[in-house]
């Protein structure tokens, strides 16, 4: 139901959603200090502006007695209590930031009027595309399915000269938060992806892969996974693997690829790495001395949130227009904002856009080297490497179907 | 509102390192983007690179193996330093605050010549 | 890299007369452009923001239009300070890029 406001006469007020359940399990205390990083940076602007206001978030903590999974099992109810919890106490900001797991958003999406607007750092499934107030800072499902629509299909580069049409897929429940909404958009058969492949099957069981790996009967030479190297090690070990095999690893939030002195194991020669394009070194800034490289972009994009809002807020009273409005509630898309580590676009639907890189494993030099990059706001791919030193014939990607020929 | 001021030496030889500092008042370096952008006599505006709040850069490809952009909190400074040198670096420098170049410097005007 | 082809060079007008110069962007960039006003010897000022924004302390003469490829600043009525030399700049696309500029004369 609604709620009044705080954010009005001069005094805006960011609801900060501090749920025990996460996309990813970062101490709370880490979020904290990149939400006052980005207050600290929003009052500055404002002030230079000459907006004489007030800023501060509101930390919503719920109880961690009912909920206390730490994963997004139980988020749903967790989302719509902190929601009671905020309504009871009329204690609602301008925006809401959080929650981040996909159960929780689509929940408190549906219940809610929502005329503010809401930014989730996560919330990576499917059920969240489209949500007219809900903006989304972290990559979301659909805009993985694009990118591998876009390169299955491509087939003009030195690379790759055939277009692929059939893929398996690994997901045996165990992923994390953003790796089960990727597989789940994947597996979904009505996605986009489904729709445009000929053949799909998903595999659930590790031997299930491993079986697959010498396969000759098998009917794709494409798996696609998602995790890091060491989860790829633990199901598929030193096993022999077909000559034309090709496995497509997402783990999009792990800039440890990109590190000088990281060199690939013999077991990710015949991976190809889709993660997102590291951009800056955030590892001298205060806010991220306590993060882990992945965690990194899940504070990133908290802080991004407060950013976000303080670049619209500006814009409004600049314009001298109410901030309680459906207006402002939609007006959080369709724009490039000043990001803590560089400019960040949404799209028109309000999801992140980025830069996404396609890794390969240098059989000459062992590093992990980016074969082609592809930006998910003009769906276009960009080759880099037009000479690999692939493991598999030719330094050519395969055909996805053993035996077929030039398409 | 945001003061800006180029400083730097007006003539530099070719192969040595162009230095200069932006010394900012009326608001902290640290609730912006800052940028470099330069104008050769007669010619267009081009950009340098940006250094973002978080203090990690992006620099125009054409000039990215010569150029560093840096910060100085505690004196509320930004720097560009460009090595190598030629005269074809000859150009009035401007810094500039915001991804939008909100705020400019009146510029300084660096020669390059023996 | 996005190319923004800015037009006329150089245009000369009288006091008074409404000047309209146009920039388009080699491809779509929503409304993430400004122009900006150079004199030599100052510091430059942007103008309009946003597209059609107008700078805080920026006479009302002047206006923006536009928004994707195609783009208009427009002095509705031109008073002698406004000799200057004019500028768009994109930032909508790393890396932000400008136009060529276009010199602005009083007869």
């Known amino acids: 139901s609604q709620v009044s406001q705080n954010c009005h006469n001069g005094s805006y007020e960011i609801s900060v959603l501090m749920m025990g359940n996460s996309a990813f399990a970062e101490p709370l205390k880490n979020l904290e200090d990149a939400v006052n990083e980005g207050l600290e940076i929003v009052r500055g602007r404002l002030q230079n502006a000459g907006l004489n206001v007030t800023v501060n978030a509101t930390f919503m903590y719920s109880d961690g007695l009912i909920h206390n999974s730490g994963d997004c099992r139980s988020s749903t109810c967790e989302g719509l209590d902190l929601l009671r919890k905020i309504s009871n106490a009329q204690r609602m900001g301008c925006v809401l930031i959080g929650p981040s797991c996909t159960y929780s958003t689509f929940q408190m999406y549906l219940d809610t009027e929502l005329s503010y607007p809401m930014i989730s750092a996560g919330s990576f499934g499917l059920s969240c595309d489209y949500k007219e107030t809900l903006t989304r800072l972290m990559s979301p499902a659909r805009k993985l399915m694009y990118f591998l629509v876009n390169f299955w299909k491509t087939n003009d580069l030195p690379f790759k000269t055939y277009s692929w049409s059939t893929s398996y897929v690994y997901k045996n429940g165990t992923e994390t938060e953003d790796c089960f909404w990727y597989l789940n958009a994947l597996e979904a058969s009505v996605s986009y992806f489904s729709h445009e492949l000929g053949f799909k099957v998903v595999l659930r069981q590790d031997k299930e892969f491993q079986d697959i790996l010498m396969d000759h009967n098998r009917k794709s030479n494409v798996i696609i996974m998602c995790g890091g190297p060491e989860f790829l090690y633990k199901l598929k070990g030193d096993r022999a693997v077909a000559e034309d095999i090709v496995i497509i690893l997402v783990d999009l939030f792990n800039d440890q690829y990109f590190e000088d002195n990281v060199t690939a194991p013999d077991y990710m020669k015949n991976v190809l790495v889709l993660t997102l394009s590291p951009g800056n070194s955030l590892l001298n800034s205060s806010f991220s001395r306590n993060l882990s490289p992945t965690k990194r972009d899940f504070a990133l994009a908290y802080l991004n949130g407060i950013l976000l809002f303080g670049h619209m807020l500006k814009i409004f009273l600049e314009n001298g227009e109410n901030i309680t409005t459906p207006k402002f509630a939609h007006a959080f898309r369709n724009l490039t904002f000043e990001g803590y580590d560089g400019p960040v676009t949404l799209d028109d639907w309000g999801d992140v856009d980025s830069t996404m890189v396609l890794l390969y494993t240098s059989v000459d030099t062992k590093k992990y080297k980016v074969l082609l990059t592809y930006d998910t706001h003009v769906n276009k791919t960009y080759p880099v490497d037009m000479s690999p030193t692939f493991t598999w014939k030719n330094s050519k990607l395969p055909n996805d179907i053993t035996g077929r020929g030039p398409q | 509102q945001v003061q800006l001021q180029e400083s730097g030496p007006g003539l530099v030889k070719p192969s040595e390192t162009l230095s200069l500092t932006c010394t900012v008042s009326?608001?902290?370096?640290?609730?912006?983007?800052w940028s470099w952008i330069r104008q050769p006599p007669g010619k267009g505006l081009e950009w340098i690179g940006y250094i973002y709040y978080s203090g990690s850069t992006n620099y125009n490809l054409s000039l990215k193996s010569r150029v560093t952009i840096s910060r100085d909190t505690s004196k509320n400074q930004v720097s560009l330093k460009l090595s190598s040198v030629t005269a074809a670096d000859t150009a009035v420098y401007y810094c500039?605050?915001?991804?939008?170049?909100?705020?400019w410097g009146q510029g300084t005007l660096v020669t390059v010549s023996s | 890299d996005i190319q923004m082809t800015q037009s006329p060079s150089s245009l000369s007008a009288s006091i008074g007369d409404r000047v309209t110069i146009t920039c388009r962007a080699s491809q779509a960039i929503r409304n993430d452009l400004g122009w900006y006003q150079l004199k030599p010897g100052k510091a430059p000022k942007r103008l309009i923001y946003?597209?059609?924004s107008l700078q805080s302390g920026v006479p009302s003469r002047f206006s923006g239009s536009g928004s994707g490829t195609e783009f208009t600043l427009t002095i509705s009525s031109l008073q002698p300070e406004d000799s200057a030399t004019y500028y768009c700049l994109q930032h909508n696309s790393f890396p932000p890029t400008f136009g060529q500029g276009t010199k602005v004369e009083i007869k």
């Open positions: 009326g608001g902290s370096i640290r609730h912006y983007y």
């Open positions: 946003s597209a059609s």
């Open positions: 500039a605050a915001g991804m939008g170049f909100d705020y």
